[in-house]
Every structure is written in structure tokens, then in C-alpha cells.
């Protein structure tokens, strides 16, 4: 007669993280008379995986009904499978005895393990940087399986190139993670730019998965300075202005200096926002020319988020009539309070 | 399925008989058989049961009988060595059935073959 | 080895009425129990495997429960063919097989 045989028909099996995974197995006689035991793992450190006699299996049911006469499918259900479940799994045929002895094991059924990725997390620089300047961006995401992953940099749409990725660990693992980082030219009109790490994988079903970083947290963009004086309705007073425009981000003070001297601090509340995401602001001076008999320099200096001061200067000759030093084109400004020095 | 038992006799104490047990009905080499006795007016107790080539024995017996099979004879044999009174028993062969991935019951039983040993 | 008690060691039952008898096993043996029947001068019968499944063609009045340690067949309303003795055999922990020492069913 012929002898026992264990067939496991499947050489490989996959399964999404979460299902339950069927491991097949048949044997082709009722005898020798012993029990059917299901390892992960060969040699002497194999691990019980499912022994009807003893051990307390939660995760494991048997296919064939409780109840099937002369059954000859030994086969497993393992639910909610996660990555630490990989591995082969051997249907062992044992011969009674005291104690019972290996008759023949299947060719065993290797469990590989489809484990979706972590959402990315993509994080930039601790500081901010101003435009001309690279900065470098990491994008993470963890716990897949198996290892073939595809991630893809973008800044607003378009596809960069300047990245370096590293899937970790090297060799065999139950799961794995992905580290990148991309380097971003900065440029004036980032504010509202986006860096966009897109991850694909086979678990994904072509829905990649995708973590952004918002460039308005990463950039600084300096103020340009302006000032310029015109005159006012009384003839000896002139109105003296501090345009500041394109700065990026909000956090500015403005200190006007007469002379070298502080005259008034201010720190900037209503400003107008560019489309590029920067904002404009303006402030002004109301002189009175005649309280003075000599030129006065009028300073306007901006510290701009935590930046070291820039400063724009204006001198004002008193000897000239009012109307002919400067333009009257200040009408849109909606500036600070005004201030008249005597 | 039938199961037929022959071979049983009066025997003196120390000697041997061989139990025959000829199988029918069924694909006789793709189950475990299975002795059982009875001894008078007693219960059931489990004497040997044989696989392919694994062979299992209550420990009353071991050493002193031997199960066997010819499957191209679909015949199932109890050689009884060193026979002593108490295995006077009528002597019953049964073929072994499982369910799912429990043990063996026994769900054919032949009429039994009566074994006295006596001087 | 599993030592299997069964009681009473003998029931006397009227025709007609319901019959209920133990098997206790000293260890668990989860539900690998199997009950027989024997009637006099006959050979054993299969009536109940993996303690409640009946065997094919037993009759419906025939009913296996329990499970680990404790065991009951239950005749609803016996017959005269009934009136035998009824063995438990596990088959969880072997060799060796071992059986009850019966129940003795008679007509009270």
C-alpha cells in the first residue's frame, strides 16, 4: 500500500494584515494512527502553531467541520493576521507513542504578509530659511509589507529629483520602513508652495498614500523697505511713510528714528496679503517742519521675525517748501497712527 | 461492512492462539483495526490496535501478543502468547473510525470470538 | 491512564419512559466521548461519537451531551430494544482506549 503522504498544496500565501489567512492541508490515509500539528518554523526551535490535543490557540480554527467522519483535511484558519505571523508553516503528520514521533511533515506554506504603510509624515527644518537657500525635508512611514515600495517627491505638482530614500532593514523582517529626504530650492513665491511625499505600495490598490509639508512653516521671506515723504494739507507739516513689502512671515516691529533717536515702536497688525502669501504693510511720520532749523534724518527700521534689524533712511530739509519734496501717492496706505513731531 | 472473528478455542495457561479477522465492505488497508475484549459478565477493555506499521497495546498484554494485518488479504490477526486465565474474554475485532482531528471510536464491531484459558 | 466512572451501574426504567445516565472521566477529555450499546449475547453498537453526534441510523430518542468531564445519554422514551448496557469509550488521551464499566438498563 502507499505510504501517508502530507500534501500542502500552496508553496506561498498572501495575505493583507488584519484577514485571516487559510493554510491547506491534506493527508492521503487515516494511518499510521497519530495526530496532525501545524508549526511555524523547522528544526528545534519551530513554533506550535495549532494542536488539537493541548494549548489554547485563539486565533486558530480548523476548516473540516468538528464533526467530519474519517477527515483527512487538516487545514488552518488563522485570523486577524499581522506582519509578526510571516513565516512557513509546516502540517506535520505525528505517529501515537509515548511520546508521539514525527511521521512526515508537508512541504510547508510560506506566509508573507501585506501590511499597509503609515500615513507619511513629512517634517522640514527646525529654522526658517529665506529664498536662494536649500532646505531638506524627511518623509517616514512605517510597518509595511512586503518591502518593494515606490516614494515620489513633488513641490506643487511637479516631480523633484534631488532626493536620497532608504528602506529599512536590509534583510528579512517581519515589516519594514521608509526614510527619505528631499532638498528644496526656496524661492520668494513659496509661501503658499506645498512638498508633497507620495508613497505606493502593493497594498495600497494604486491609492497612494501622501504627507505634505506646507512651505509657509519653512520659509522667510524679508521685507523690502520704502520711504518716502509727501506733503499734507498744512503747509508745514509733511507726511513721511515706511512702505514694507513682501515679507513673509507676519511677525514684523517698526521703529521709527529721529535723528538716531527712537521716536515710536509699532508692531504690525492690519496688513494687506499679496497673492504670492506675502504681506505689505505701511507706516507713517506727520512732521512739522517748521519746529525744526535743521535737516532731520528720519530712520525706519524693521525687525522681521526674529531677524536682525534692516533699516531705510529719509532726510528731510527743512529749508525746502514742503510741496515740492516728494509725491502725494499714499492715499491706499491704511498705515499706523499718526504721529507729529515738534 | 462485516467483520468476522475466528481462532478462539480453549487453551491451557502458557500456551498460544492466533485470532483471525477477516474484513469486508470497506478499503480494509486505509484504517486502524482494533482488538477489544470482554471477559464473562465483565465490560469492554481495549486490548490492541495496529495502524499501517504502528501497533498499540494495553499494557495487560505487551510483550505477550501481537496485532498484524494483511491488507492483500484484508485480514487482521491477534497472535496470543503465554495465555493466562484472566484473558479468558470473548475477543471482538472493530474497525477504528476518527472525527475531524480527535481519536479513534470504533464504529464496526464483529460478533466476537470466545477465548477460554483453562486447565 | 483516563478512568471513565459511569452511573447508576444499573437503571431500572419502565417502557415508555426517559432514561438519563452518567459517564464521569477523571481528567478532561474535551469531547472525544463515545457512547455504545450492548444487548445480551451481541456485539457493541456505535450510538454517539464526539459526545452528541449520532451515528447513522441511530434513532432520534438517543441524545449525547456534555463535554470535559462530565457526559450524559439520554433515551427519551425507551423501547423494549433499548433495555441493554450502555458503555462511554474516550478516545482523547491513548493508548490505552478506555471504557466505562457500563450501565446495566432493565425493565423495571
Known amino acids: 500500500e502507499e505510504e501517508l503522504q502530507v500534501i500542502q498544496p500552496d508553496k506561498s500565501v498572501s495575505v493583507a494584515a488584519g484577514e485571516s489567512a487559510i493554510l491547506h492541508c491534506t493527508v492521503t490515509s487515516l494511518i499510521p494512527v497519530g495526530p496532525i500539528q501545524w508549526f511555524r518554523g523547522a528544526g528545534p526551535a519551530r513554533e506550535l502553531i495549532y494542536n488539537q490535543k493541548e494549548g489554547h490557540f485563539p486565533r486558530v480554527t480548523t476548516v473540516s467541520e468538528s464533526t467530519k467522519r474519517e477527515n483527512m483535511d487538516f487545514s488552518i484558519s488563522i485570523s486577524n493576521i499581522t506582519p509578526a505571523d510571516a513565516g512557513t508553516y509546516y502540517c506535520v503528520k505525528f505517529r501515537k507513542g509515548s511520546p508521539d514521533t514525527e511521521f512526515k511533515s508537508g512541504a510547508g506554506t510560506e506566509l508573507s504578509v501585506r501590511a499597509k504603510p503609515s500615513a507619511p509624515v513629512v517634517s522640514g527644518p527646525a529654522a526658517r530659511a529665506t529664498p536662494q537657500h536649500t532646505v531638506s525635508f524627511t518623509c517616514e512611514s512605517h510597518g509595511f509589507s512586503p518591502r518593494d515600495i515606490t516614494l515620489k517627491w513633488f513641490k506643487n505638482g511637479n516631480e523633484l529629483s534631488d532626493f536620497q530614500t532608504n528602506v529599512d532593514p536590509v534583510g528579512e523582517s517581519v515589516s519594514y520602513s521608509i526614510h527619505s529626504t528631499a532638498k528644496v530650492v526656496l524661492t520668494r513665491e513659496d509661501v503658499h508652495s506645498q512638498v508633497i511625499c507620495e508613497v505606493a505600495h502593493v497594498t495600497l490598490q494604486g491609492d497612494p498614500l501622501r504627507g505634505t509639508a506646507n512651505l509657509s512653516e519653512t520659509i522667510r521671506v524679508p521685507p523690502t523697505l520704502e520711504v518716502t515723504q509727501q506733503p499734507v494739507r498744512a503747509e508745514n507739516q509733511v507726511n513721511v511713510t515706511c512702505q514694507v513689502r513682501k515679507f513673509y512671515p507676519q511677525r514684523l516691529q517698526l521703529t521709527w528714528l529721529e535723528n538716531g533717536n527712537v521716536s515710536r515702536t509699532e508692531t504690525a497688525s492690519t496688513v494687506t496679503e499679496n497673492k504670492d502669501g506675502t504681506y505689505n504693510w505701511m507706516s507713517w511720520l506727520l512732521v512739522n517742519v517748521s519746529a525744526h532749523r535743521d535737516d532731520v534724518k528720519l530712520t525706519c527700521q524693521v525687525e522681521h521675525d526674529g531677524q536682525p534689524a534692516v533699516s531705510k533712511s529719509h532726510d528731510l530739509k527743512v529749508s525746502a517748501h514742503p510741496k515740492e519734496q516728494g509725491s502725494n501717492t499714499a492715499a491706499e496706505n491704511t498705515g499706523s497712527n499718526e504721529r507729529n513731531i515738534y | 461492512v462485516q467483520l468476522l472473528e475466528s481462532g478462539g478455542g480453549v487453551v491451557q495457561p502458557g500456551g498460544s492462539l492466533r485470532l483471525s479477522c477477516a474484513a469486508s465492505?470497506?478499503?480494509?488497508?486505509?484504517?486502524?483495526m482494533t482488538w477489544v475484549r470482554q471477559a464473562p459478565g465483565e465490560g469492554l477493555e481495549w486490548v490492541s490496535t495496529i495502524g499501517s506499521g504502528d501497533t498499540y497495546y494495553a499494557d495487560s498484554v505487551k510483550g505477550r501478543f501481537t496485532i498484524s494485518r494483511d491488507n492483500s488479504k484484508n485480514t487482521l490477526y491477534l497472535q496470543m502468547n503465554s495465555l493466562r486465565a484472566e484473558d479468558t474474554a470473548v475477543y471482538y475485532c472493530?474497525?477504528?473510525?476518527?472525527?475531524?482531528?480527535?481519536?479513534?471510536?470504533?464504529?464496526?464491531w464483529g460478533l466476537g470470538t470466545l477465548v477460554t484459558v483453562s486447565s | 491512564e483516563i478512568v471513565l466512572t459511569q452511573s447508576p451501574a444499573t437503571l431500572s426504567v419502565s417502557p415508555g419512559e426517559r432514561a438519563t445516565f452518567s459517564c464521569r472521566a477523571s481528567?478532561?477529555?474535551?469531547?472525544?466521548l463515545a457512547w455504545y450499546q450492548q444487548r445480551p449475547g451481541q456485539a457493541p453498537r456505535l450510538l454517539i461519537y464526539?459526545?452528541?453526534i449520532r451515528e447513522t441510523g441511530i434513532p432520534e430518542r438517543f441524545s449525547g451531551s456534555g463535554s470535559g468531564t462530565e457526559f450524559t445519554l439520554t433515551i427519551t422514551s425507551l423501547q423494549s430494544e433499548d433495555f441493554a448496557v450502555y458503555y462511554c469509550q474516550q478516545y482523547y488521551d491513548w493508548p490505552p482506549f478506555t471504557f466505562g464499566g457500563g450501565t446495566k438498563v432493565e425493565i423495571k
Open positions: 472493530a474497525k477504528d473510525s476518527t472525527v475531524s482531528w480527535s481519536g479513534d471510536f470504533f464504529d464496526y
Open positions: 464526539a459526545a452528541r
Open positions: 481528567q478532561n477529555v474535551k469531547n472525544d
Open positions: 465492505g470497506f478499503s480494509f488497508s486505509n484504517f486502524a
